[in-house]
């Protein structure tokens, strides 16, 4: 018996089709991925294949101007629309709290909602009960196929979940579900989940019963032979994972942004055993035309969009200095003001002894675009700051050895004086630059704000200690030449987009004033 | 849990038919195809075709093409191998199995003598 | 269509040892690889399916490996109970192909 699994993960609010780097769509020729596109695909494999499931695996929520505007009301519809039959949870659904995932999103879709490793408790046992399932059977064609969630347990430090929900170890948590599957005679089950490349890997292993995984979070790319596009694939399609009880289990998951729609064929024997499995990403470049339905659907929808964009989110009393002459050679009230927002986005106070899990946040003077004049009335909008911030970046979360932070901080004085972007505007830290001495040796003080402490103080900063720091994705992917941050980071969970992180700050803080403040020196 | 039940043995002459039949429980029958292979005594394994319960839909191996005829009858999930023009080479246990051939049916003797 | 050779036709094991049974395609069958033990007696079971999975019930003593057009199957410590006629099986092509068996008897 043959399934056609199609999967998404980590669209992030890419409702629209993108360019190839997954940025706003500028020549339309060229762009790719959204979701007239992806619902022409999907339409087209399901008039040619039997026995079709369409499956998300988490992190629809977040990443352009469409969620920040519509807080998920654009998932639920569009996912309906593409007549979705599953998806997981993923960290960033959280990311508006539990009401902000059960009213637009978990209410009004049409597809179940997974997640087999989030226990509700105290009041929102009853309120959320039967929003989401740990499990959901569905038939197809003559058979039925057991889909079992998962999300990332790191869930309570990379969005707002609140405290009457556990997020519980996911294979403890998978294999009691999957048992009671097993029991009901339903012998074909995917694990569809959220928490990464490597714990989907070890769901493979050691989850017994689960026979294919659908991940996300990772935004890992697959691909069996000469990749179609940039990405570099980090291993085959399916990835085979060898389980403990000696089945080969395929493992998949497909980049991000919308880009591609993952397509796993899968050959089930009766007893439920994968007898093989291949496909592909397929690239939703442009010889897939978008559907006209869809593509007018969203052309309603994107209305509201343009209207909120020159709406006022606050006001600055102070001229907002985004200029390449201050913030790519010394401290800049911008850069100060980003930084305070981004730190701001990822208060999660989990623990009595932690004031908060993440103090700081550096970020590359280059990616500052645009200054915001005082004198329009002090008003900001989400166009001012798409000028200031472009490329559609995210603000993420590592955690790097103080050796590595070190590194980082050479490398942002290597050649100062000649306006290079790779100058790092900080939160949380105050470094100290000798410019006299030699490249690779100008840091000669740098301190960093505690966290396990209830009374925030700057301590030298310790070269073994592992640190948590708030940066652009670009810096995470090595940008500007920070390869030591991408070679040596310990972990690295994407975070909010750039613009919303900020935005939301100005309006949380009505009227900003941000000083230089002698943050770097 | 997957089982295939044959029918009982039987006895035939040079140029008879024989009919055997495979009934099938445990599983989504119309999902699935089924296998039939031959051992003659003191032999290997010899796949004769394989027939989608679905559509009816077969494939034979060359060497039994045009003697050999697979059935299915879905309102009994029960598949059938009938084999004509029987030879004394004919006699053999004859199995049905799975689609991958992960169950497989009790076998069935077809002695074929004068 | 696809030769199987198997190898060897026969051999004899103590409990305990190390046995190692192989494959060989007539051309590439890319892992669509079954083997089976049919004990004394008829009584057909699949062991492995797809080159290396185990089925399930069967004991992680017996493994499968290989790729292309040669394959293997192992038995880590024999047992009383593995002596037994060991097959494989192609299915990557019509007509599928069973190779020679292996009958695996006690020293």
């Known amino acids: 018996w043959e399934l056609t699994i199609l999967h998404t993960n980590d669209v992030h609010s890419r409702l629209e089709q993108t360019s190839e780097d997954s940025s706003k769509c500028v020549n339309a020729s060229r762009c790719m991925g959204g979701v007239a596109r992806l619902f022409t695909k999907v339409q087209q494999i399901r008039r040619a294949e039997p026995n079709v499931l369409l499956l998300d695996a988490g992190d629809q929520y977040q990443g352009t101007i469409w969620f920040t505007v519509y807080k998920g009301a654009e998932v639920a519809h569009f996912m309906n629309a593409l007549r979705y039959d599953a998806m997981a949870l993923g960290n960033h659904e959280f990311d508006n709290g539990v009401e902000g995932l059960i009213e637009p999103l978990l209410k009004e879709a049409k597809f179940p909602i997974l997640s087999a490793n989030i226990k509700a408790k105290g009041p929102l046992a009853s309120q959320i009960s039967g929003l989401y399932l740990p499990y959901k059977v569905l038939p197809v064609g003559d058979e039925v196929v057991g889909i079992v969630g998962y999300t990332s347990k790191e869930t309570p430090f990379l969005s707002n979940p609140g405290t009457n929900l556990v997020f519980e170890d996911e294979i403890t948590a998978l294999q009691p579900e999957v048992d009671k599957l097993k029991t009901l005679n339903v012998n074909k089950i995917i694990a569809l989940g959220h928490s990464g490349f490597e714990m989907d890997k070890l769901i493979a292993q050691k989850v017994r019963g689960v026979d294919v995984v659908v991940g996300g979070h990772s935004n890992t790319f697959l691909y069996t032979g000469n990749p179609p596009s940039k990405e570099v694939p980090a291993g085959k399609y399916p990835f085979i994972v060898t389980s403990d009880d000696g089945r080969k289990v395929p493992v998949v998951q497909a980049y991000a942004f919308g880009k591609y729609l993952g397509y796993l064929k899968i050959e089930f024997d009766e007893r439920g055993n994968v007898i093989s499995s291949h496909g592909n990403p397929i690239l939703l470049n442009s010889s897939i035309p978008e559907d006209p339905s869809i593509k007018a659907d969203i052309n309603k929808w994107r209305i509201k969009l343009d209207n909120y964009s020159t709406q006022e989110l606050g006001k600055t009393i102070v001229y907002l200095d985004g200029s390449s002459q201050s913030c790519r050679f010394r401290e800049c009230n911008m850069g100060n003001l980003i930084c305070d927002a981004m730190i701001n986005n990822n208060l999660r106070h989990t623990d009595e002894m932690f004031w908060n899990h993440v103090s700081m946040c550096i970020l590359n003077g280059g990616g500052i675009r645009s200054p915001i004049d005082e004198r329009n009335n002090g008003t900001i909008t989400w166009e001012n700051l798409a000028a200031v911030l472009p490329f559609g970046g995210t603000f993420d979360l590592v955690q790097l050895k103080g050796s590595t932070l070190k590194k980082a901080f050479e490398h942002s004085v290597h050649r100062y004086g000649q306006s290079t972007g790779e100058f790092l505007q900080v939160g949380g830290i105050h470094v100290v630059y000798d410019l006299s001495r030699k490249p690779g040796d100008r840091v000669v003080k740098l301190d960093v704000l505690c966290t396990k402490c209830r009374v925030p103080s700057y301590d030298p900063l310790k070269m073994d200690e592992v640190y948590k720091v708030i940066l652009p994705n670009f810096l995470a992917n090595g940008g500007d030449g920070f390869q030591m941050i991408k070679d040596e980071l310990l972990r690295h969970d994407s975070g909010d987009q750039d613009i919303n992180v900020v935005s939301t700050y100005i309006s949380k803080m009505k009227v900003i004033y941000p000083a230089v403040e002698g943050r770097i020196k | 849990e997957v089982q295939l039940v044959q029918s009982g043995a039987e006895v035939k002459k040079p140029g008879a038919s024989v009919k055997v039949s495979c009934k099938a429980s445990?599983?989504?029958?119309?999902?699935?195809?089924m296998n039939w292979v031959m051992q003659a005594p003191g032999q290997s394994l010899e796949w004769i075709g394989r027939?989608?319960?679905?559509?009816?839909?077969?494939f034979y191996s060359q060497k039994f093409k045009g003697r050999a005829t697979l059935t299915v009858d879905k309102s009994t999930s029960t598949v059938y191998m009938e084999l004509r023009s029987l030879r004394s080479e004919d006699t053999a246990v004859y199995y049905c199995?799975?689609?991958?051939?992960?169950?497989w049916g009790q076998g069935t003797t077809v002695t074929v003598s004068s | 269509d696809i030769q199987m050779t198997q190898s060897p036709s026969s051999l004899s094991a103590s409990v305990g040892d190390r046995v190692t049974i192989t494959c060989r395609a007539s051309?590439?069958?890319?892992?669509?690889l079954n083997w089976l033990q049919q004990k004394p007696g008829g009584a057909l079971k699949r062991l492995i399916y797809?080159?290396?999975s185990l089925d399930s019930g069967v004991p992680s003593r017996f493994s499968g490996s290989g790729s292309g057009s040669d394959y293997t199957l192992t038995i880590s410590s024999l047992q009383p109970e593995d002596f037994a006629t060991y097959y494989c099986?192609?299915?990557?092509?019509?007509?599928?192909?069973f190779g020679g068996g292996t009958k695996v008897e006690i020293k």
């Open positions: 051309q590439d069958i890319g892992d669509s």
């Open positions: 099986l192609q299915y990557a092509s019509f007509p599928w192909t």
């Open positions: 445990g599983y989504t029958f119309t999902a699935y195809f």
């Open positions: 199995a799975t689609s991958y051939v992960g169950d």
């Open positions: 027939i989608y319960h679905n559509n009816g839909d077969t």
């Open positions: 797809a080159t290396s």
